[in-house]
């Protein structure tokens, strides 16, 4: 039975040219996290595997940095980066948990972060 829940940064916004941290956290389960996939609208951004470490997709290598933790840092943001992002937690024995984050990249200098998840 899957008892875990995923908390995410929720709906967030950032300035064009800036950077943003995408963060998910799996709680309420003792399942072993074997891998976390980060996806954007049917595209693989990065994978963090418990044994193998990080793999960043070649087309995102210049703009995506692993971490902090199991999170992902997007850099040099453009308006085209606006959209849905998903963290897919592969766990054993529970199975797969998915979290959703919506990022809006703004032209203006006013970009407010969602407050549902505190990033240290």
């Amino acid at each position: 039975m899957m008892t875990g829940t995923i908390e995410t940064t929720g709906n967030i916004s950032a300035e064009k040219g800036g950077s943003i941290i995408l963060q998910c956290h799996l709680s309420s389960t003792t399942a072993q996290v074997t891998q976390v996939n980060w996806e954007q609208q049917d595209q693989l951004l990065a994978i963090c595997n418990a044994d193998l470490g990080w793999h960043i997709s070649p087309s995102f290598k210049d703009r995506v940095a692993p971490g902090p933790g199991l999170g992902l840092t997007l850099q040099s943001l453009t308006v085209n980066d606006t959209g849905e992002y998903f963290c897919i937690y592969h766990t054993y024995p529970d199975g797969t948990y998915t979290g959703r984050i919506f990022l809006e990249v703004l032209e203006s200098s006013v970009a407010e972060h969602g407050a549902r998840f505190q990033i240290p």
């Epitope: 074997t34 891998q35 996806e39 049917d42 693989l44 994978i47 418990a50 193998l52 024995p93």
Partner: antibody, heavy 118, light 107 residues
Framework: EVQLLESGGGLVQPGGSLRLSCAAS????????MNWVRQAPGKGLEWVAA????????SYADSVKGRFTISRDNSKNTLYLQMNSLRAEDTAVYYC???????????WGQGTLVTVSS | DIQMTQSPSSLSASVGDRVTITCRAS??????LNWYQQKPGKAPKLLIY???SLQSGVPSRFSGSGSGTDFTLTISSLQPEDFATYYC?????????FGGGTKVEIK
């Protein structure tokens, strides 16, 4: 350098058994999921079975379920495929393949031929 | 099971030609699509993974695109060493399944 070397193929009668081995070198074997994929003469590729590295989770194609058993010995860096109740339609070249991140198979062995015939 | 349908099953082309091979999944598989090249008597070789990522060491004339159910492998300028059979494979769910293959022959 990553290397995968299959062995154990040969001629076997219908109903017989065979055990294939895949010796791995050049990488941390225990960290990777591994697969067996087969190819009948003149035909396409067919996935047979997989075993994960971290949890030992196993899955099989319906065509071999209950007859084939995939296993691994991380201390020997070796993947196995125990094949029982062999049928003529199991005749194929059997490849082992490494699967990082559970998405793609990046390295394959050279294959070993299994022929099931009376 | 997810069925993978490749087209065409074979094609004839000349060196320098642009070649396109398509692969269609029977249900959405997101980006979980890989392309392999196989030459006679040899093991398959990974070309493209996760729909569009070029495997290290593979020439840049190979590219992949698509998501969901429809995918494409493109060879921008066919070279003599590219004459081979190409397979797509989905890794979205088990059983893992391959397309039937596309044999690229010399015209």
């Amino acid at each position: 350098e990553v290397q995968l070397l299959e062995s154990g193929g040969g001629l076997v009668q219908p109903g017989g058994s065979l055990r294939l081995s895949c010796a791995a070198s050049g990488f941390t074997f225990s960290s990777y999921s591994m697969n067996w994929v087969r190819q009948a003469p003149g035909k396409g590729l067919e996935w047979v079975a997989a075993i994960s590295g971290s949890t030992g989770t196993i899955s099989y194609a319906d065509s071999v379920k209950g007859r084939f058993t995939i296993s691994r010995d991380n201390s020997k860096n070796t993947l196995y495929l125990q094949m029982n109740s062999l049928r003529a339609e199991d005749t194929a070249v059997y490849y082992c393949a490494r699967e990082p991140y559970g998405v793609w198979m990046d390295y394959w062995g050279q294959g070993t031929l299994v022929t099931v015939s009376s | 099971d997810i069925q993978m349908t490749q087209s065409p099953s074979s094609l004839s082309a000349s060196v320098g030609d642009r070649v396109t091979i398509t692969c269609r999944a029977s249900q959405s598989i997101s980006y979980y699509l890989n392309w392999y090249q196989q030459k006679p008597g040899k093991a398959p070789k990974l070309l493209i993974y996760a729909a569009s990522s070029l495997q290290s060491g593979v020439p840049s004339r190979f590219s992949g695109s698509g998501s969901g159910t429809d995918f494409t492998l493109t060879i921008s300028s066919l070279q003599p060493e590219d004459f081979a059979t190409y397979y797509c494979q989905q890794s979205y769910s088990t059983p893992l399944t391959f397309g039937g293959g596309t044999k690229v022959e010399i015209k």
